[in-house]
């Protein structure tokens, strides 16, 4: 019972984590314009892995995709790769783990096969989570480096005359979503690996013991005892993640209650 619960919980946690990794990868707010200690602008810049956006205080938002592949920084490419690898591994892990779930019966699949599949999916979730955490951390490190560089060069120009105010970027919401999602996927993977140990059939062979009774001799030899729990599950399928994303390159996104002016 505990094994099934651990496996099921691991699956759900990983599912939420992978949904989060997908969401973070698609989000535009990987880096956002730093507003602290800066001249107050009527324009707000933010950037994602795939496009950069500008939101005016008027509510008009314009996003431009990074249409070049070779012109992009190597670090950004690396982050993209890590996130995509994380998503792919996570998706495969989810597929494998569905068939590995103890509450789902598929033909006459042995418990040993389910245990192997559970372990495989667990490892995939762990690697997926680590990829996401690594990707987000690399991007965060890149931001920190650029932040201090742009702070040092905040005011550029001849003879100390201010020429331009450089836009500084700080951590966006996607980074926090990515870290949390990566962590959840990692935890889910660990739980799957723990569940795998409980699923593996233990062949415990007890040595023959002779019981001598008066009158006649009886030899009692118990065979290998295999514990099996027939767990009849009535689990309902819940839709955890709906990845319906809508992107527009130029939209008048009207001022909302959370917009700044």
């Amino acid at each position: 019972m505990a094994v099934t619960a651990c496996q099921g919980l691991g699956f759900v946690v990983s599912l939420i984590g992978i949904a989060g990794i997908i969401a973070a990868t698609c989000m535009d707010q990987w880096s956002t314009q730093d507003l602290y200690n800066n001249p107050v602008t009527a324009v707000f810049n933010y950037q994602g892995l795939w496009r950069s956006c500008v939101r005016e205080s008027s509510g008009f938002t314009e996003c431009r995709g990074y249409f070049t592949l070779l012109g992009l920084p190597a670090m950004l490419q690396a982050v993209r790769a890590l996130m995509i690898v994380g998503i792919v591994l996570g998706a495969i892990g989810l597929l494998v783990s569905i068939f590995a779930l103890k509450c789902i019966r598929i033909g006459s699949m042995e418990d040993s096969a389910k245990a192997n599949m559970t372990l495989t999916s667990g490892i995939m979730f762990i690697v997926s989570g680590l990829c996401a955490i690594a990707g987000v951390s690399v991007f965060a490190n890149m931001l920190v480096t650029n932040f201090w560089m742009s702070t040092a060069n905040m005011y550029t120009g001849m003879g100390g005359m201010v020429q331009t105010v450089q836009t500084r970027y700080t951590f966006g919401a996607a980074l926090f979503v990515g870290w949390v999602a990566g962590g959840l996927t990692l935890i889910g993977g660990v739980m799957m690996c723990i569940a795998c140990r409980g699923l593996a059939p233990e062949e415990t062979n007890y040595k023959a013991v002779s019981y001598h009774a008066s009158g006649h001799s009886v030899a009692y030899k118990p065979g290998g005892f295999k514990a099996s729990t027939g767990f009849g599950s009535n689990t309902k399928n819940k839709k955890i993640y709906d990845g319906g994303a809508r992107t527009e390159d130029e939209v008048q996104s009207y001022p909302s209650k959370h917009d700044y002016v």
Partner: antibody, heavy 118, light 113 residues
């Protein structure tokens, strides 16, 4: 078409307050910011502040901070600008305008002349 | 505050001739995020509210005649009326739409010579 209709001219005493209204039509009131700009007689334009009618969020020109209050009433789709502690140099035509892309003002009210005189 | 300096203060041009108005900002109005300059040009005729001509330094507002054009980047901007018409007699203002407070230039009065 888009129109912004402002309240009529006002004559005020120094130290008093004035409240000018601006009623836009031809678009959804909460979808665009409303800015207030004033113009003293024979002078240039001076931005006073702006309001997001949907949230009530405001941004002010520090020159008027504490004296100007911008509000919006969603039920009547009307924006208001109140200027307190009036002095003679506040005599001007006050305009409301709709902020659009480029943070520019595409539609303006006809203007409200506020005269501050003792 | 960002200071917007317009030159000249007034300009007398013959009908059909080119009129050029300059506007200088104390700080760059170029946004690195979209490479757009947040500068707007308005036309104001006596007794009327200002009328939007050009935004993003060079994008003409719909309905504005194509004889009006905007150019420049960073700190220096220009409004050009390629062939002055009688109805173009007005005061022209440039506006900083990037930094708060949103500031206007002092205005340039265009007259017919």
């Amino acid at each position: 078409q888009v129109q912004l209709v402002q309240s009529g001219a006002e004559v005020k005493k120094p130290g008093s307050s004035v409240k000018v209204s601006c009623k836009p039509s031809g678009y959804t009131f909460t979808n665009y910011l409303i800015d207030w700009v004033r113009q003293a007689p024979g002078q240039g334009l001076e931005w006073m502040g702006g309001i997001n009618p949907g949230s009530g969020d405001t941004v002010y020109n520090e020159k008027f901070q504490g004296r100007v209050t911008l509000t919006a009433d969603e039920s009547t789709s009307t924006a208001y600008m109140e200027l307190s502690s009036l002095r003679s140099e506040d005599t001007a035509v006050y305009f409301c305008a709709r902020r659009v892309r480029g943070n520019s003002f595409d539609s303006w009210g006809q203007g409200t002349l506020v005269t501050v005189s003792s | 505050d960002i200071v917007m300096t317009q030159s000249p203060d007034s300009l007398a041009v013959s009908l059909g001739e080119r009129a050029t108005i300059n506007c200088k900002s104390s700080q760059s109005l170029l946004n690195s995020g979209n490479q757009k300059n947040y500068l707007t040009w308005y036309q104001q005729k006596p007794g009327q509210p200002p009328k939007l001509l050009i935004y993003w330094a060079s994008t003409r507002e719909s309905g504005v005649p194509d004889r009006f054009s905007g150019s420049g980047s960073g700190k220096d901007f220009t409004l050009t009326i390629s062939s002055l018409q009688a109805e173009d007699v007005a005061v022209y203002y440039c506006q900083n739409n990037y930094f708060y407070p949103l500031t206007f230039g002092g205005g340039t009065k265009v007259e017919i010579k």
